[in-house]
Structure formats: C-alpha cells, structure tokens
Amino acid sequence: RKAVLDCEAMKTNEFPSPCLDSKTKVVMKGQNVSMFCSHKNKSLQITYSLFRRKTHLGTQDGKGEPAIFNLSITEAHESGPYKCKAQVTSCSKYSRDFSFTIVDPVTSPVLNIMVIQTETDRHITLHCLSVNGSLPINYTFFENHVAISPAISKYDREPAEFNLTKKNPGEEEEYRCEAKNRLPNYATYSHPVTMPSTGGDSCPFCLK
C-alpha cells in the first residue's frame, strides 16, 4: 500500500463507477430533490462532483457515506441528464446518466353524477375529470370515504366513468373522486357530492 497511489495502481474492482440515484424520480417544477452519489468501496477518501450535462453543480467529499446534493427543479431542462464523478487522487470514474421525469400536478377534479331512478334501484353514473396535470391520470371513486372502484387510468383528457346500482338507500351518501398521476404522494380530491336519502324531488341528479 503506497502513501501516494495513482490511478494505474488501482484495480478496476477496487474503484468501480459510482452510483447516482434519487428517492424521487418523478418531480414537479419547483420541487426540491436530493441526489445521492455513492461508491461500493467504503474505505476510499472519495471526492464526488455532480454535473448536469456539462455544468458543474457541486463537489463534496466522503468516506463510507454517500454525497448528498440538494437541488431545485425549476425548469424543464433541469430534468437532466445528471452524472456523478467519483475521484480518488488522479483516478476518476463517472456514473451512468440519471434523469428526472417532470410531471405537472393534477388539479382538483370535478365530480359529476347522473342518476336513473327506478322504484327499487338507483343506477348511478359517476364522472370525474381533472382538466390539468400530466397524463396518464388515475381516478378512483369513493363512497362515504371508502373506495368503490379500482384505479381507472385515463390517457386522454376525458372523464373517468364508473357505474353502480344501489337499492334506494335509507340515508344520505357522499361521493367524491381522487385524481392522481405519476407524482408520488400527490393526489387531489373533488368536492364531495351528497346524494339525498330518498327519491322524488329531493333527488336533483335523478332522471326518471
């Protein structure tokens, strides 16, 4: 083991390429993200540098722990690609490219209800549409805070539709829908729509 060790003296398996990753791969504009640059060799004194295309964004050193770079994604061109350079003295290796997917968040969806009332049943059609947000959008319908539909994926700007038939209920029921796209932990809900307990004039959505 030399006091001064150059790149030629380092075996490839001792100094492989670093790994660049982020817990958040899908982001919206204005979001803060953390990028982690790490190396398999936990004994080396490594200097990590982060680049976006050819722009140098920052440098940190670390031994046995990843370098953490905190960024804000404000523009489309900031999606990437990003690269991390790991350097030990004169020896350096680059990570694979990493790019974020920028997604526009969904806006609160609008829930429309159409009801066909019969003597014994109500045939309910629920329509849910979010007019903004990157596609595809997954819609889920809820009755009294309980999901009553699977996630319905829409790849176009058309409402999701869900049909159900119910015996004429004896009490009010509240419906709402959720819109969600690829942004993690980011879902929006429609305003609730309450269905009255009995038919007749008190059913404003009913078609007789």
Epitope: V4, S43, T47, D61, V88, T89, S90
Partner: antibody, heavy 117, light 111 residues
Framework: EVQLVESGGGLVQPGGSLRLSCAAS????????MIWVRQAPGKCLEWIGI???????YFANWAKGRFTISRDNSKNTVYLQMNSLRAEDTAVYYC???????????WGQGTLVTVSS | DIQMTQSPSSLSASVGDRVTITCQAS??????LSWYQQKPGKAPKLLIY???TLASGVPSRFSGSGSGTDFTLTISSLQPEDFATYYC?????????????FGCGTKVTVL
C-alpha cells in the same frame, strides 16, 4: 523520490504574520487533500486544518479567523498563512497529504515557527 | 466537534511486555481512526489505519481494534525501537470544521 518540504518558518514577533509553504517533489499534489499539523515543544500533535482537492478549507475551531490554507497547483505547493501570531503558536509545523484512504501517511520534516519579542 | 481522549498519558514498560493504549472519541467516528508513532525530532509515522488495518512495512506486533468511540492500540511484545510517543487521530467520514483531532499522546518509556 517522493518527498515533502515545509519552509517559511523562523522567528516572528507577536502580532506578526508568516506564510509557510509545503512543496512536493516526485508526485503531484493537485488531487490530494492536504492537512497542516503543528506540535509545540514537548506538547501534543494538533490538527490545524485541511484543504480539499477542490480547494474548500476546514479548520479546527481555535484556528478559524487567524489561519488560512491555500494551494497553487501550478507550483505543486500548499500554503499556511498565519496572522496575529502569539507566543503559544510557537511550534513545528508539518504538512501531509491524505492517502487514498483519507489518512496522512507521507510527512515532511516540519518547519519551526518561533513567536517571541 | 470531535475530541480524542488518549490514555494513559505515559507508561513505563520493559522489552517483551504487552502494551495497550486506548483512545476515546467524543462522538462516534465509525472506524475512521489511525495510530501514529513519533520519535523525538521526527515526523509521525503511520502504524494503523481504519482502526485495525496495519500500514505497509509495520511489524505485526502492532495491532488495532475498536469502532464507534472506543479504540485500542496493542503492542504484543515491546521491542527496543518501540519506545516512542503514540498518537491516535480520529476523523469524521466527511471533511468539516473541527472534524479531525489527535489524541494528546502516550509516551512509552523504559521501565
């Protein structure tokens, strides 16, 4: 031959300044983290600070404000600038590069700084 | 901030003795600790790095152990050339202000 040579030490009056140099021969300092360490006569080794390969510097709390570290890669030299010197700064000053594992292994012979009126 | 407390500050021993020196870090530093030997008028010499790895050219009678906050340097059978002062050096994994510190040394003298 790989070696380090510290220079610039000598006698200086209290309140004065001094710049120490650490020059490498036989290898390039450019990509190495460099530390400065001192040892007062008969006392412990004391870590002063470090300059990283990317020119960021870090110091022991007692050295902040009075000491600065810089590097000139074209001259293969690292510097320790010491200001407002006091009698208690009298010591042998060493520089050392971190090896690839982050430990100082190669040391110079040191340069003696004496602060006295 | 990191502080390294080394003990004992001095000890007397005879050739062939087993000698143990301890170093305690004020906070956990993993295994980022090295041991140095220094003789009068000379620069320090690296003995052990990463708490337990023997540096190149260092006799096998020297060994290191420990991690976190408590570390030990052991000389299994003291030789005449081992009478010197020994220092530990602790550091965090990432460079930082006050992130590196020496212990205050253990002077090993002839009994």
């Amino acid at each position: 031959e790989v070696q380090l040579v510290e220079s610039g030490g000598g006698l200086v009056q209290p309140g004065g300044s001094l710049r120490l140099s650490c020059a490498a021969s036989g290898f390039s300092l450019n990509n190495y983290f460099m530390i400065w360490v001192r040892q007062a006569p008969g006392k412990c080794l004391e870590w002063i600070g470090i300059i990283t390969s990317y020119h960021t510097t870090y110091f022991a709390n007692w050295a902040k404000g009075r000491f600065t570290i810089s590097r000139d890669n074209s001259k293969n030299t690292v510097y320790l600038q010491m200001n407002s010197l006091r009698a208690e700064d009298t010591a042998v000053y060493y520089c050392a590069p971190y090896d690839i594992y982050g430990y100082p292994t190669l040391w110079g012979q040191g340069t003696l700084v004496t602060v006295s009126s | 901030d990191i502080q390294m407390t080394q003990s004992p500050s001095s000890l007397s021993a005879s050739v062939g003795d087993r000698v143990t020196i301890t170093c305690q870090a004020s906070q956990s530093i993993g295994a980022y600790l090295s041991w140095y030997q220094q003789k009068p008028g000379k620069a320090p010499k690296l003995l052990i790095y990463e708490a337990s790895t023997l540096a190149s050219g260092v006799p096998s009678r020297f060994s290191g152990s420990g991690s976190g906050t408590d570390f030990t340097l052991t000389i299994s059978s003291l030789q005449p050339e081992d009478f010197a002062t020994y220092y530990c050096l602790g550091a965090y994994g990432r460079s930082s202000d006050d992130g590196t510190a020496f212990g205050c040394g253990t002077k090993v003298t002839v009994l």
